[in-house]
Interface confidence: low
């Protein structure tokens, strides 16, 4: 399964949409988990409502919200107030009993303006990756996040 790279700005929201076959996954709950290392286990962050018919209701765990449109076959995860610590590899999963089928692997990158005083010199421009069918990203338009200037030598 390919990994989709999604980018969001620190302090903003990042919306991830994972699409799936609505018939194949009929009756299954969905989950969003964070992968611990390349081959490590996937730690559950949040899952959809325990009653499948209520999966459209938003479920929240901390700053992460999940909702499932079971007719359209789209589960949406929103990471609010993105922080550096939110960066990493995640999975959208479809749950069947104790088994989980991976719908999409997502690498979350958190961007911000260059440098802060504690972290002199730590900058990066990520490689662009073409988003493909199965996951997409929306950036919120809030622009009130203030970022400190880099130090000047």
């Amino acid at each position: 399964l390919n990994t989709t790279v999604l980018q969001g700005m620190a302090g903003q929201s990042l919306r991830v949409s994972c699409t799936y076959d609505a018939l194949k996954h009929w009756g299954r709950r969905k989950a969003w988990c964070r992968q611990l290392g390349e081959e490590g286990p996937c730690q559950r962050v949040v899952s959809t409502h325990g009653v499948w018919l209520l999966a459209f209701l938003k479920k929240r765990n901390g700053s992460t919200v999940i909702a499932d449109d079971t007719l359209a076959g789209t589960v949406t995860i929103t990471l609010k107030n993105l922080q550096a610590g939110d960066a990493g590899l995640y999975q959208c999963q479809s749950l069947r009993g104790r088994e989980a089928e991976v719908l999409q692997k997502v690498l979350v990158e958190v961007l911000e303006d260059p440098l802060d005083d504690q972290d002199a010199g730590d900058l990066w421009v990520p490689e662009e990756s073409s988003s493909f069918e199965g996951a997409q990203v929306e950036h919120s338009t809030s622009r009130n996040q203030e970022t400190s200037f880099p130090p000047t030598s």
Epitope: L111, V125, P126
Partner: antibody, heavy 126, light 107 residues
Framework: QVQLVQSGAEVKKPGASVKVSCKAS????????ISWVRQAPGQGLEWMGW????????NYAQKLQGRVTMTTDTSTSTAYMELRSLRSDDTAVYYC???????????????????WGQGTLVTVSS | EIVLTQSPATLSLSPGERATLSCRAS??????LAWYQQKPGQAPRLLIY???KRATGIPARFSGSGSGTDFTLTISSLEPEDFAVYYC?????????FGGGTKVEIK
């Protein structure tokens, strides 16, 4: 694909101003900064400054402070560099480049100026 | 500001030979150093970032090494298209300075 397209060549008289544009496409403009770099004929590269397309923060090279202004128009994904009180030694090719911007992912963070615009020749001559 | 000194200013080599370019910083820049290639009439092209990481699409014959104040760009076997000017740039502190460049020319 990610692309930066700059405005055309300009000929200016000493004391005048020039405004060079840099139109971005292929990426989320407000997620990145834009740097401006110039190169006088036969010379090396000189970093002029940087602007965040996200919140408008700027950082200018000290020698250009007071003469240069960098702005962005997020509605058109365009960055602008205006240089005032032009002198003959401002004759150069002016480049815009995406970056730098910090990113966190997994284990590390790095920097690049990539891509670059095609360059805009500004000639200052009386 | 951080001053980057590149040496040699000119390197005369033949295709197939190994090129070793040096960049020295006036103070530590950790690994926050990039290398660019520029051909006449063209914009610079990113080769290496974070001192040793090859940018997308850059051939394996280009490699970067070093950290702190001393950095090296190595072209293991020069191809005809590699003859150009190479610049290093520190991205540790504003202002983000460039070295003076090394011209790699055909012998």
């Amino acid at each position: 694909q990610v692309q930066l397209v700059q405005s055309g060549a300009e000929v200016k008289k000493p004391g005048a101003s020039v405004k060079v544009s840099c139109k971005a496409s292929g990426y989320t403009f407000t997620n990145y900064g834009i740097s401006w770099v110039r190169q006088a004929p036969g010379q090396g590269l000189e970093w002029m400054g940087w602007i965040s397309a996200y919140n408008g923060n700027t950082n200018y090279a000290q020698k250009l402070q007071g003469r240069v202004t960098m702005t962005t128009d997020t509605s058109t994904s365009t960055a602008y560099m205006e240089l005032r009180s032009l002198r003959s030694d401002d004759t150069a090719v002016y480049y815009c480049a995406r970056g730098p911007t910090k990113a966190y992912y997994g284990s590390g963070s790095y920097v690049v100026f990539d891509p670059w615009g095609q360059g805009t020749l500004v000639t200052v001559s009386s | 500001e951080i001053v980057l000194t590149q040496s040699p200013a000119t390197l005369s080599l033949s295709p197939g030979e190994r090129a070793t370019l040096s960049c020295r910083a006036s103070q530590s820049v950790s690994s926050y150093l990039a290398w660019y290639q520029q051909k006449p009439g063209q914009a610079p092209r990113l080769l290496i970032y974070d001192a040793s990481k090859r940018a997308t699409g850059i051939p394996a014959r280009f490699s970067g090494s070093g950290s702190g104040t001393d950095f090296t760009l190595t072209i293991s076997s020069l191809e005809p298209e590699d003859f150009a000017v190479y610049y290093c740039q520190q991205v540790s502190l504003f202002p983000l300075t460039f070295g003076g460049g090394t011209k790699v020319e055909i012998k």
